[in-house]
Amino acid sequence: DQDTGSWEQLVQARRSHKASPAAHLTGANSSSMGTGGPLLWETQLGLAFLRGLGYHDGALVTTQAGYYYIYSKVQLGGVGCPQGLATDLPVTHGLYKRTTRYPEELELLVSRRSPCGRAASSRVWWDSSFLGGVVHLEAGEEVVVRVLEEQLVRLRDGTRSYFGAFMV
Amino acid sequence: DQDTGSWEQLVQARRSHKASPAAHLTGANSSSMGTGGPLLWETQLGLAFLRGLGYHDGALVTTQAGYYYIYSKVQLGGVGCPQGLATDLPVTHGLYKRTTRYPEELELLVSRRSPCGRAASSRVWWDSSFLGGVVHLEAGEEVVVRVLEEQLVRLRDGTRSYFGAFMV
Amino acid sequence: DQDTGSWEQLVQARRSHKASPAAHLTGANSSSMGTGGPLLWETQLGLAFLRGLGYHDGALVTTQAGYYYIYSKVQLGGVGCPQGLATDLPVTHGLYKRTTRYPEELELLVSRRSPCGRAASSRVWWDSSFLGGVVHLEAGEEVVVRVLEEQLVRLRDGTRSYFGAFMV
């Protein structure tokens, strides 16, 4: 039986477990470019790392197919409610997949929030949005984070807004 | 080839997978001591457990180096905003690392919220803050949970405020 | 030594790692039946899948004992505050265990929120609740998601409200 007889396969299983793909990317001053693109991330400094995953223009890129728990947190904050924010635009935070098999990004995990009415008597408000879930990714597929109202994302020091994944 | 030739290493890999470090700690009446220290946790009763991780004065302590998904949820609640809370003090919930290599705790994952203005016509308000992310920890390093406004954390029954980790 | 000498066990370890239990279930129009039961989920279409876990009437069902990271997100939303909502009921979102060993469901992870006061000048409000944590489950035990105020859960396209688990 090929499945039971291959020492190399077992070794490979051990190796892959040893280096099971994982990544944690952190917010940085350059994360929000204001261009309507996805958020960009720090990949090496401080708490950020890539292990068995690649990075390209804001995207985590898989090197092997499998099920991944992907997650992102964004710190939201503002002074007052930008004209019409509470009325017109909830804040949408989402994780999206890019694949060569489709021309458009696919929604994976999405949240909407109406944050700026939260602080009763204050002009300053804070909110946080967390997303996490298991998705199947083929090798070479990409995952990005988007916040439509990206001017409300507080990036600062890398602990408040971040993006990561690991194989399950 | 040493990597492919070691039966013991393969067995060890299997054993370690079998008992991959994991923990889930729960809130209890004694969780908030009001001393400005980290939150304290139940480690054995009910849903709480430790597997391949230690516990000391509120901290999860690693016994082996690696990448860990660490998480915490705190249930926030109160009656009105006596602090002028929305104005003066957002609630800050964070996971912090203690290591012998640095004298001070290091921020790992942090959220800020302005919760107490949330309930429109109610004096009583509730909010919840979830944090989770992958960090690298050396053996013997510690992770703690802090909430600056710890009196606003509801700890009582163990399902609403908790703290955990597992190796990825 | 049986533990070190069993080729079959090693192979099984590889196989089980290859197919470590995992699932991600997504919201659908039929998720909320308005019957007071748990939320129901899509198990096959789109992003939904089951791998080494079963599904029955809203519940993820384990096929093997172990520690599982279980998670759920629900997208909440409404138009204004239904008469007395802020006054009457915070929104409670929870993960609960069903086991043949107890007649009643057991709370595992729970959040309460006061969402509908969040949008300051808007009749429309959005909020999102995320829960995740590690629990021990025996084979055949079930986990369900409940939101007491299920009419406020927005299910739509499967990316905003979901439920999943994986073995750690």
């Epitope: - | 016509s121 109610s122 009583v124 700890l155 | 006054t87």
Partner: antibody, heavy 121, light 107 residues
Framework: QVQLQESGPGLVKPSGTLSLTCAVS?????????WNWVRQPPGKGLEWIGE???????NYNPSLKSRVTMSVDKAKNQFSLKLNSVTAADTAVYYC??????????????WGQGTTVTVSS | AIQLTQSPSSLSASVGDRVTITCRAS??????LAWFQQKPGKPPKLLIF???DLESGVSSRFSGSGSGTDFTLTISSLQPGDFATYYC?????????FGQGTRLEIK
């Protein structure tokens, strides 16, 4: 152990102003609490007058709002009540009470002994 | 304002009896209800908060239940010191309101 003690005149003339102070001992007024005033007319039930926090936030009973003022003196660790344009209907025992405003423990758990105020000419 | 209606307004019972007092809110208040005991010439004493949580130092003979609009205070076995007036209070929304009271007398 927090204790509360009301003080103020026991007799007030009609149309005058009722002024009471509640001294907080055994704890700080600058904690996550509401500091309340509740009154009880002779032989009747309890009526909430209003609350104040250490940061000066106030909430009053709408039935009394136009006549009530509450304030906090953090330096003296005390809070006070002023009720103007009083009538005989304001004759009551006046209590001050602490309400815990934290997540795990709500409720008015500490009360003063009460002070009787009579409105009469 | 939310109205709280207690029943009965008064009752007579004997030492050792099990007694139940109910409190109905005019609209839902979640679990934001407290129960107080008051003896003549004394301030109210907090017994139960959040509808069912026993205040520290209060005898476990007292218990509370309910959520939404209907609440109950139960005294499992009356003792001589339990004869007093009992009030429910909602603290969920402004203004804070109290029930009219239930007077518990010795039979």
């Amino acid at each position: 152990q927090v204790q509360l003690q009301e003080s103020g005149p026991g007799l007030v003339k009609p149309s005058g102003t009722l002024s009471l102070t509640c001294a907080v001992s055994g704890g700080s007024i600058s904690s996550i609490n509401w500091w309340n005033w509740v009154r009880q007319p002779p032989g009747k039930g309890l009526e909430w007058i209003g609350e104040v926090s250490h940061s000066g936030i106030t909430n009053y009973n709408p039935s009394l709002k136009s006549r009530v003022t509450m304030s906090v003196d953090k330096a003296k660790n005390q809070f006070s009540l002023k009720l103007n344009s009083v009538t005989a209907a304001d004759t009551a025992v006046y209590y001050c009470a602490r309400e815990r405003a934290v997540a795990d423990y709500h409720g008015m758990d500490v009360w003063g002994q009460g002070t009787t105020v009579t409105v009469s000419s | 304002a939310i109205q709280l209606t207690q029943s009965p307004s008064s009752l007579s019972a004997s030492v050792g009896d099990r007694v139940t007092i109910t409190c109905r809110a005019s609209q839902g208040i979640s679990s934001a209800l407290a129960w107080f005991q008051q003896k003549p010439g004394k301030p109210p004493k907090l017994l139960i908060f959040d509808a069912s949580d026993l205040e520290s130092g209060v005898s476990s003979r007292f218990s509370g239940s309910g959520s939404g609009t209907d609440f109950t205070l139960t005294i499992s076995s009356l003792q001589p010191g339990d004869f007093a007036t009992y009030y429910c209070q909602q603290f969920n929304s402004y203004p804070i309101t109290f029930g009219q009271g239930t007077r518990l007398e010795i039979k």
